[in-house]
Amino acid sequence: QAAPFPELCSYTWEAVDTKNNVLYKINICGSVDIVQCGPSSAVCMHDLKTRTYHSVGDSVLRSATRSLLEFNTTVSCDQQGTNHRVQSSIAFLCGKTLGTPEFVTATECVHYFEWRTTAACKKDIFKANKEVPCYVFDEELRKHDLNPLIKLSGAYLVDDSDPDTSLFINVCRDIDTLRDPGSQLRACPPGTAACLVRGHQAFDVGQPRDGLKVVRKDRLVLSYVREEAGKLDFCDGHSPAVTITFVCPSERREGTIPKLTAKSNCRYEIEWITEYACHRDYLESKTCSLSGEQQDVSIDLTPLAQSGGSSYISDGKEYLFYLNVCGETEIQFCNKKQAAVCQVKKSDTSQVKAAGRYHNQTLRYSDGDLTLIYFGGDECSSGFQRMSVINFECNKTAGNDGKGTPVFTGEVDCTYEFTWDTEYACVHHHHHH
């Protein structure tokens, strides 16, 4: 039986049940290569409290559909008196990066995971030439996730004192230049994640090979190497390589530019101080507030919730968007879709789509940007579920009693973007991270 998601096969992936202090290792095409789980384990569970290992999915006992992967075992489990077998179930959804498997829940018999990934899309529009896992768990099982830094189009310019060259990078995947045919970036060879431009020539100085690594609690490392043979003539016989170290800052701050810290014989060392390198709980919340010791800030968007069935309305030329954030109030137009953002076609108001659901909410504050994300909306033709990204700006003089109003800024591949100026986005900082 052919592997259902070949892009995911090259790596052993990790997921964590934080509540129970359990680390899962997942290899969807082969075995995880952990002795304690046996030679054919595809999903190996490491209980750190009891220091025990259990195989909860066997690679030989795999069954797959386009959106679900199940690994059974021969181990019995007692579920309400019936003789079931322990199994793992991974539900796949279309995403814009390789993504990460997320632990959902576990019963006596079944360990459930969800994975939003390009590998599950109906079309190849989000697929990279080359992409590697872009997250890591530290020794305290806290997740550090650089997926939000991955650019689906374009690149980051590395700050370098050399006026004759420009070094462009992407994070964990190659640089896509198709959306900007006029720039210097266009000359970069396909597959490169680190592209050096000198004059009118562009050189591949690194492609992603291995996933993100953690070197210390707040330092993550990504390494790129030039795959193809044939040395570049300006590298003195050495093969080019790029090492990017992502550093979690010691206190809250605006984002910084990736900086070249060392360069010798085409070995480039880059340091990037960014809060995305911090553990995810420092940056994100499933509610509409971020506060307390954990996050070093106080943010509360709950006053933006609308009561009594009214919604914020944002004009999107062909569409109207109805938004009801930070609550679970049904939007009248949205046919009981549990939508936080609802898209209605102006020319045919029966065409209604959920552009993100209120149960699928993430509030993120990182590198000075405050963003509220709603995902899990109605599917587009690619298989990607519509989502909405609301970028908040602090405005102490916002109208509508300080609440302000969301403004639609555009759509990219079924992701709807809004900006929202409001006094409730004014962040209060604590200083003790």
């Epitope: 189009s153 980051y156 310019l157 420009s166 045919p181 720039s183 210097q184 605006e254 000075g368 555009g410």
Partner: nanobody
Framework: QVQLQESGGGLVQAGGSLRLSCEAS????????WGWFRQAPGKEREFVAA????????SYADSVKGRFTISRDNAKNTIYLQMNSLKPEDTAVYYC????????????????WGQGTQVTVSS
């Protein structure tokens, strides 16, 4: 690719103000970063100011800091350059540009350009 059209240039006395506009049409991706550049006769095109579309993070050339302000109106797909306390050395053709490169002020990293609008500051 995105199309850009500048407007708002003209002749102004030193110390005066102008507001330039740049309207973006076509598929305006939110991944773009937007910039204003200028080119005086016989000189290279130079960076003036930049803004990210999805947030209001800005950067400015030292020569215009405190005098020029870049802003955006997402609803109108338009970016602006408010120029105050204008000096004769601000005389140039001003261009609006879009880039898919983050953290750049280098004109060669901008792939989409407007036609430019002339600003002349008389003493």
């Amino acid at each position: 690719q995105v199309q850009l059209q500048e407007s708002g240039g003209g002749l102004v006395q030193a110390g005066g103000s102008l507001r330039l506009s740049c309207e973006a049409s076509g598929r305006t991706f939110n991944t773009y970063n937007w910039g204003w550049f200028r080119q005086a006769p016989g000189k290279e095109r130079e960076f003036v100011a930049a803004i990210r579309w999805s947030s209001s993070k800005t950067s400015y050339a030292d020569s215009v800091k405190g005098r020029f302000t870049i802003s955006r109106d997402n609803a109108k797909n338009t970016i602006y350059l408010q120029m105050n306390s204008l000096k004769p050395e601000d005389t140039a053709v001003y261009y609006c540009a879009a880039s898919i490169v983050d953290f750049t002020t280098n004109p060669s990293h901008f792939g989409s350009w407007g036609q430019g609008t002339q600003v002349t500051v008389s003493s």
